[in-house]
């Protein structure tokens, strides 16, 4: 029951972060108008990954794409490609940890069959939301670096008399989106790890056992009894083979360098 | 088409206080910024504030701020301009305008006259 | 707040001449995220509201002739009426649309010669 509530909650946790990776990679505001300096306005910027905007105090609202790939920066693309690699792993994860649910019984699929499926999903989550954390500190660190800049520029050239108030960017909404839905898809994905211990058979040592015939005695050594992964109950007696998943000490957790704002 | 109407023209003593009506007709008036803005004779333009129907947002001009006061009535279409403590220096046309694309001022009343006399 | 500094003060023009208008802003009114000025433009004939001309510093409003164009960019900015008609006998005003509070230039009064 705990090993169902924990995969249920498992998939339920990566499926709203999945969402959240979706939502702030199409969102326009990962950069927004510094307004310290310029705090009446009457003209708002704010940036995307796919198009920055401009928002009148008018209310009007203008959007322009950026119709270039070679013009951008290495660093927007390279957010961008983390994103969607998120995306299409977490989706990949959300397919197979589907059939994985067990609360949904597909033909005769053997636990050991949904153990692997669980723990490819929870691996698979937990390198989405690495991903979308990454893009999003990435993107984070390049807004810190030019928010510096810029204010270094501010200060200098005409002799302090400068005319031009250059814009300068701070964090959007969709950073803290980001941040918050790579965390909990992360977080979805080692629940579902740990939800595969609970389903996987125990890897059962049966004790030779004597079963003395009417004529002759003959000893009979159950074998062959090797689950998938070592962990769980396996109260069947029936054998299993190898389903190629991997055991809790071969999951990998992909460590990578970020510079965390 | 587009059409602000302003109320007539008015007469006050200095210390007393005026209301200016702009009736709005020929669009959506809660999705628009109603400004208003000072024209003293003979002299040039100067903003005071405006107004977003919508959810009674305002802006106000620093120079005008605690003195004007400006509300609208979107059942009626209808935005109000009051200015309180009249003094003779506030003798002018005040027209309403509609906030458009680019910041501008598309669509402007015909003004109304308020003359500050003892 | 941006002051607008308009010149000259006032213009006599010929009939079918050229008539130049200045417009300086204290500040740039220029946005980095469109890469537009946000100046307007506006005329007022006598005993009538101001009427909309251009805005964007360039961007002619509908139904505003084509003699009528405007340009410049930053603090610096220039209506230009390529040939004068009598119905542009008007006073002449640009505005600061970038930054509260809006503000208004003193305005240039357009004559005929």
């Known amino acids: 029951m705990a090993v169902t509530a924990c995969q249920g909650l498992g998939f339920v946790v990566s499926l709203i972060g999945i969402a959240g990776i979706i939502a702030a990679t199409c969102m326009d505001q990962w950069s927004t108008q510094d307004l310290y300096n310029n705090p009446v306005t009457a003209v708002f910027n704010y940036q995307g990954l796919w198009r920055s905007c401009v928002r009148e105090s008018s209310g009007f609202t203008e959007c322009r794409g950026y119709f270039t790939l070679l013009g951008l920066p290495a660093m927007l693309q390279a957010v961008r490609a983390l994103m969607i690699v998120g995306i299409v792993l977490g989706a990949i994860g959300l397919l197979v940890s589907i059939f994985a649910l067990k609360c949904i019984r597909i033909g005769s699929m053997e636990d050991s069959a949904k153990a692997n499926m669980t723990l490819t999903s929870g691996i698979m989550f937990i390198v989405s939301g690495l991903c979308a954390i990454a893009g999003v500190s990435v993107f984070a660190n390049m807004l810190v670096t030019n928010f510096w800049m810029s204010t270094a520029n501010m200060y200098t050239g005409m002799g302090g008399m400068v005319q031009t108030v250059q814009t300068r960017y701070t964090f959007g909404a969709a950073l803290f989106v980001g941040w918050v839905a790579g965390g909990l898809t992360l977080i979805g994905g080692v629940m579902m790890c740990i939800a595969c211990r609970g389903l996987a058979p125990e890897e059962t040592n049966y004790k030779a056992v004597s079963y003395h015939a009417s004529g002759h005695s003959v000893a009979y050594k159950p074998g062959g009894f090797k689950a998938s992964t070592g962990f769980g109950s396996n109260t069947k007696n029936k054998k299993i083979y190898d389903g190629g998943a991997r055991t809790e000490d071969e999951v990998q957790s992909y460590p990578s360098k970020h510079d965390y704002v | 088409q587009v059409q602000l109407v302003q109320s007539g023209a008015e007469v006050k003593k200095p210390g007393a206080s005026v209301k200016v009506s702009c009736k709005a007709s020929g669009y959506a008036f809660s999705n628009y910024w109603m400004n208003w803005v000072k024209q003293a004779p003979g002299q040039g333009l100067e903003w005071i504030g405006q107004?977003?129907?919508?959810?009674?947002?305002?802006k106000y001009n620093g120079n005008f701020k605690g003195r004007a006061t400006l509300t609208a009535d979107t059942s009626a279409s209808t935005a109000y301009m009051e200015l309180s403590s009249l003094r003779s220096e506030d003798t002018a046309v005040y027209f309403c305008a509609r906030y458009y694309r680019g910041n501008c001022f598309d669509y402007w009343g015909q003004g109304t006259l308020v003359t500050v006399s003892s | 707040d941006i002051v607008m500094t308009q010149s000259p003060d006032s213009l006599a023009v010929s009939l079918g001449e050229r008539a130049t208008i200045n417009c300086k802003s204290s500040q740039s009114l220029l946005n980095s995220g469109n890469q537009k000025n946000y100046l307007t433009w506006y005329q007022q004939k006598p005993g009538q509201p101001p009427k909309l001309l251009i805005y964007?510093?360039?961007t002619r409003d509908s139904g505003v002739p084509d003699r009528f164009s405007g340009s410049g960019s930053g603090t610096d900015f220039t209506l230009t009426i390529s040939s004068l008609q009598a119905e542009d006998v008007a006073v002449y005003y640009c505005q600061n649309a970038y930054t509260y509070p809006l503000t208004f230039g003193g305005g240039t009064k357009v004559e005929i010669k």
């Open positions: 964007w510093a360039s």
């Open positions: 107004i977003y129907p919508g959810n009674g947002d305002t």
